[in-house]
């Protein structure tokens, strides 16, 4: 697909292998771990880069308070099943042949079974809640700065479009992101909320995906904008599925 | 003009292994990654796996995995396939082809004859 | 894996006539750009020998009597005039995703 033509590398995707013998002999980038072409002028798949990941030598009132159906990934790292678009599959098993439902951005969404477990369809993350904690600054950041700056940084970095950022919250020191995305808004191009956050999360711990580019340097009106945690809620369009005795652990 | 030259022919003892060179040159060797084919005596085509020499990343057939190693000197333009744990079915002409698919040039072939 | 599965197995065609080879790739290899599927063709004795590359870009100084077509999951090789030097067995490959599986080959003889 299309890249940067004249050193043959992927801006968008450093987990990537280029070379010139794509179509006409030009630069096609390919993702490691599943050998799949990406399209370098976007963002790859949160799918596509978890497996490269695994395969590379390597006011109150205005917080959100996450749902008790959201998902918090617990799990870390694993090798997805990706589909042939590269995203996620339904059913994640691993190499003890222990299988889960995951939902679109690929966290686990019931509890962990045999082969026989079914996952009928892959059911999509609609509202992703990121919290996160600034480092201690002179003052607090005002309100309407912040949430500019970060709209531009997803609409900028991210390329998503500044419909699906739905709010930032703001209460020092604590910062809120909400992204929204029903299927029925997802036009084919636009940019996926779940790879954007995962851009977004890797960047905020100094892991950029990006090719070349410094890490992430979060300015609000000059000031640095440093995230000591980060904590992602992920909200499906249907619940998830899980035992009584996970609940009430 | 591009070149891919393999080793010579071999024959194996079952449980040996054996290790296939492909010689590279009128081309930036760096740049392209190197794919593996294995053809049984009138057999199809059957990819094992590739390399890509500038970072030395590769892929493999799961069904080569574990007995198939890919390598690469960049120094002598030179990539390797190493298959392990040879028994009869291994018997088969292997090739070294430019590119992921779609191989634009193909080495010779290298005969691997597995016979006790 | 993909599997690819061409027809027919073997076919013979005169001379001069137009020959046709299906490929069937078990899942869809394209995008709306491109689409990751090749053509080989191979004599006894030698190395596979690329004739399109991305389902109808044809390799430099193959013959334009060889056309690609298809997208999806249906690929056609076509040779338009069957010329004596054509007789080879034809593959077909993905590379989609890994592995980059080939076809089982169709085997064209002369009527």
């Known amino acids: 697909h299309t890249a940067a033509q004249d050193n043959c590398t992927c801006p968008t995707n450093k987990m990537t292998v280029c070379s010139p013998d794509g179509p006409g002999g030009r630069c096609q980038c390919r993702a490691l771990g599943s050998g799949m072409a990406v399209d370098c002028s976007t963002l790859t798949s949160k799918c596509l880069l978890l497996k490269a990941r695994m395969s590379a030598p390597k006011n109150a009132r205005t917080l959100v308070r996450p749902s008790e159906h959201a998902l918090v990934d617990n799990d870390g790292l694993y090798d997805p099943d990706c589909d042939p678009e590269g995203r996620f599959k339904a059913r994640q098993c691993n190499q003890t042949s222990v299988c889960w439902c995951v939902n679109s951005v690929g966290v686990r969404r019931t509890d962990k079974g045999d082969l026989s477990l079914r996952c009928d369809e892959l059911v999509r993350t609609h509202h992703i809640l990121i919290d996160l904690r600034h480092r201690p600054t002179a003052g607090a950041f005002n309100h309407s700065d912040l949430d500019a700056e970060l709209r531009r940084l997803f609409r900028e970095r991210y390329r998503l479009h500044p419909k699906f950022v739905a709010a930032v919250h703001y209460e020092q020191p604590t910062i809120q992101i909400e992204l929204r995305q029903n299927t029925s808004q997802k036009a084919a191009g636009d940019v996926d909320i779940g790879d954007a956050a995962y851009y977004f999360e890797r960047d905020i711990k100094g892991e950029s995906l990006f090719q070349g580019r410094g890490g992430l340097d979060l300015r609000v009106r000059g000031e640095p904008l440093q995230v000591e945690r980060t904590l992602i809620y992920y909200l499906d369009e249907i619940p998830p599925k899980f035992s009584m005795k996970r609940l009430t652990a | 003009q591009v070149q891919l030259v393999q080793s010579g022919a071999e024959v194996k003892k079952p449980g040996a292994s054996v290790k296939v060179s492909c010689k590279a040159s009128?081309?930036?060797?760096?740049?392209?990654?190197i794919g593996w084919v294995k053809q049984a005596p009138g057999q199809g085509l059957e990819w094992i796996g590739d390399?890509?020499?500038?970072?030395?990343?590769?892929n493999y057939n799961e069904k080569f995995k574990g007995r198939a190693t890919l390598t690469a000197d960049t120094s002598a333009s030179t990539a390797y396939m190493e298959l392990s744990s040879l028994r009869s079915e291994d018997t088969a002409v292997y090739y070294c082809?430019?590119?992921?698919?779609?191989?634009?040039?193909w080495g010779q072939g290298t005969l691997v004859t597995v016979s006790s | 894996d993909i599997v690819m599965t061409q027809s027919p197995d073997s076919l013979a065609v005169s001379l001069g006539e137009r020959a046709t080879i299906n490929c069937r790739a078990s899942?869809?290899?394209?995008?709306?750009?491109?689409?990751?599927m090749h053509w080989y063709q191979q004599k006894p004795g030698q190395p596979p020998k690329l004739l399109i590359k991305?389902?109808?870009n044809l390799e430099s100084g193959v013959p334009d009597r060889f056309s690609g077509s298809g997208s999806g999951t249906d690929f056609t090789l076509t040779i338009s005039s069957l010329q004596a030097e054509d007789v080879a067995v034809y593959y077909c490959?993905?590379?989609?995703?890994?592995?980059?599986?080939f076809g089982q080959g169709t085997k064209l003889e002369i009527k």
């Open positions: 082809a430019r590119g992921t698919g779609g191989g634009d040039y």
């Open positions: 009128g081309y930036t060797f760096t740049n392209y990654w």
């Open positions: 390399i890509y020499p500038g970072g030395g990343y590769t």
């Open positions: 899942q869809s290899v394209s995008t709306s750009s491109y689409s990751y």
């Open positions: 991305y389902a109808s």
């Open positions: 490959q993905h590379s989609w995703e890994i592995p980059y599986t």
